[in-house]
């Protein structure tokens, strides 16, 4: 069954945590649907964003952070492992120095930590997708 | 009650027709939600777009057409009559030479016809909004 979009969930992250998302674009790639995943510092959507991950399907991926209300330097990738009309599985793993983003089991993007992952309190998944799975797994201490 | 988004409806347009849309952005303007309205030449989403109207709330509006599968010259406006967090009413009227877009009763944007409005067969409303009303009114002959 489908999860509501935008989908918001409280989360605590640290090295070893993984966020897993399963979904499908709502439009053909010609129409450039978006997927966005934001790791927020508060439960409020206006809060700072530790890791912003935005896919313009079929075109590009941009990653960034929003600190003290201001967007910082954007990182762009033309790598496009997503398939038009197909379901995707996205997993974002917290490594000691960066986030590693896997798409359908394939390492596709990385983003160096700018703010400690422990600052994350909420994850939001939104834009032009249907969402079937959202999970945060925590490393067993 | 809410209409599904993306929302797609068959439509025939000509001079005097008006498309009316009521909705609300799904996120605060800081997060740059989008609204998109596309007038298509076929019932298929990959078809050409006679009039493409995309709002990046709080930032800008772009208008364009997609002809023989290719985007043409974009028209951009910084005019932003939409209010953060507020419901909007959008009406797109077909004039003899252009589309006139009204936001909350105020004339806000125009776009000269590149393709005859009679080529429109479908209207799609989508991206980051909740939709409460969609109506196409036809001029009484």
């Amino acid at each position: 069954s489908l999860l509501p979009v935008p989908y918001t969930e409280a989360a605590s992250l640290s090295t070893g945590s993984t966020v897993t998302i399963k979904g499908r674009p709502l439009a053909c790639f010609l129409n450039e649907p978006y997927l966005q995943v934001d790791f927020h510092t508060e439960m409020k959507e206006e809060s700072d964003i530790v890791f912003h991950f935005q896919v313009c399907f079929g075109r590009r991926v941009v990653m960034n952070s929003r600190e003290y209300g201001a967007w910082k330097q954007q990182v762009e990738s033309k790598n496009m492992p997503f398939q038009d009309g197909q379901e995707f599985e996205l997993s974002i793993s917290v490594l000691p120095d960066k986030y590693q983003v896997m798409v359908n089991g394939q390492s596709s993007y990385t983003f160096d930590h700018r703010i400690k992952p422990e600052a994350v309190k909420m994850v939001q998944v939104w834009r032009d997708i249907s969402l079937t799975k959202f999970n945060v797994s925590y490393l067993k201490r | 009650s809410l209409l599904p988004v993306p929302y797609t409806e068959a439509a025939s347009l000509s001079t005097g027709s008006t498309v009316t849309i009521k909705g609300r952005p799904l996120a605060c303007f800081l997060n740059e939600p989008y609204l998109q309205v596309d007038f298509h030449t076929e019932m298929k989403e990959e078809s050409d777009i006679v009039f493409h109207f995309q709002v990046c709330f709080g930032r800008r509006v772009v208008m364009n057409s997609r002809e023989y599968g290719a985007w043409k010259q974009q028209v951009e406006s910084k005019n932003m009559p939409f209010q953060d967090g507020q419901e909007f009413e959008l009406s797109i009227s077909v004039l003899p030479d252009k589309y006139q877009v009204m936001v909350n009763g105020q004339s806000s944007y125009t776009f000269d016809h590149r393709i005859k409005p009679e080529a429109v067969k479908m209207v799609q409303v989508w991206r980051d909004i909740s939709l409460t009303k969609f109506n196409v009114s036809y001029l009484k002959r």
Epitope: - | T15, T41, E42, K44, E46, S47, D48, E67, Y68, G69, P96, D97, K98, D112, H113, R114, I115, K116, E118, A119
Partner: antibody, heavy 116, light 112 residues
């Protein structure tokens, strides 16, 4: 990119027949109306015939009505013009073309010469 | 029968500006006629330049511009170049049905 390539022209005697073809690529052929336009030597272009995207509606210039038949095969991305009872005044370069309220894209043309 | 009128010939100096017009034998050209302009050089197929009054096709230099002026459609070439010497045709859209796109007789432009 959009490409239209005509073929099937040639020299034919008055009263004879020819079948012109236009192979389309680079766009979703079945979504678009198509036209044949001809240009006689030293003259301007002249509309000959139209067919709508599904093939259900066809239109002809008075000068060719009853002699020419336009058709299309959307599965093969192909536009056809069957020309019967040809006359010397049908001598022209024949172009296939497409557009919404004009002719955005043209083929390179195929020469038809009707002469004894 | 609809007749679309154009100047048979015009000339322009290199670097100069010239305006070609496209009219109707009876009545005015309006936006609903979606005037379009084409360029043809000897031995070549016509090439679409402008459609829907003033929209340029991709790859068309911006020295070509379209408008409606008075009761006619117009094509203006600003900063004419030697390669602009050609025949120019306009079409007007006359509504749905048979022969809905009508050609003008053409203008031969000489760049002196």
């Amino acid at each position: 990119q959009v490409q239209l390539v005509e073929s099937g022209g040639g020299l034919v005697q008055p009263g004879g027949s020819l079948r012109l073809s236009c192979a389309a690529s680079g766009f979703t052929f079945g979504n678009y109306d198509m036209s044949w336009v001809r240009q006689a030597p030293g003259k301007g272009p002249e509309w000959v015939s139209d067919i709508n995207s599904g093939g259900g509606s066809t239109y002809y210039a008075d000068s060719v009505k009853g002699r020419f038949t336009i058709s299309r095969d959307n599965a093969k991305n192909s536009l056809l013009l069957q020309m019967n009872s040809l006359k010397p005044e049908d001598t022209a370069v024949y172009y296939c073309a497409t557009g919404y309220t004009g002719y955005y894209y043209w083929g390179q043309g195929t020469q038809v010469t009707v002469s004894s | 029968q609809t007749v679309v009128t154009q100047e048979p010939s015009l000339s322009v100096s290199p670097g100069g500006t010239v305006t070609l017009t496209c009219g109707l034998s009876s009545g005015s050209v309006t936006s609903s006629n979606y005037p379009a302009w084409y360029q043809q050089t000897p031995g070549q197929a016509p090439r679409a330049l402008i459609y829907s009054i003033n929209s340029r096709h991709s790859g068309v230099p911006d020295r070509f511009s379209g408008s409606i002026s008075g009761n006619k459609a117009a094509l203006t070439i600003t900063g004419a170049q030697a390669e602009d010497e050609a025949d120019y045709y306009c079409t007007l859209y006359m509504g749905t049905g048979s022969n809905n796109v009508v050609f003008g007789g053409g203008t031969h432009l000489t760049v002196l």
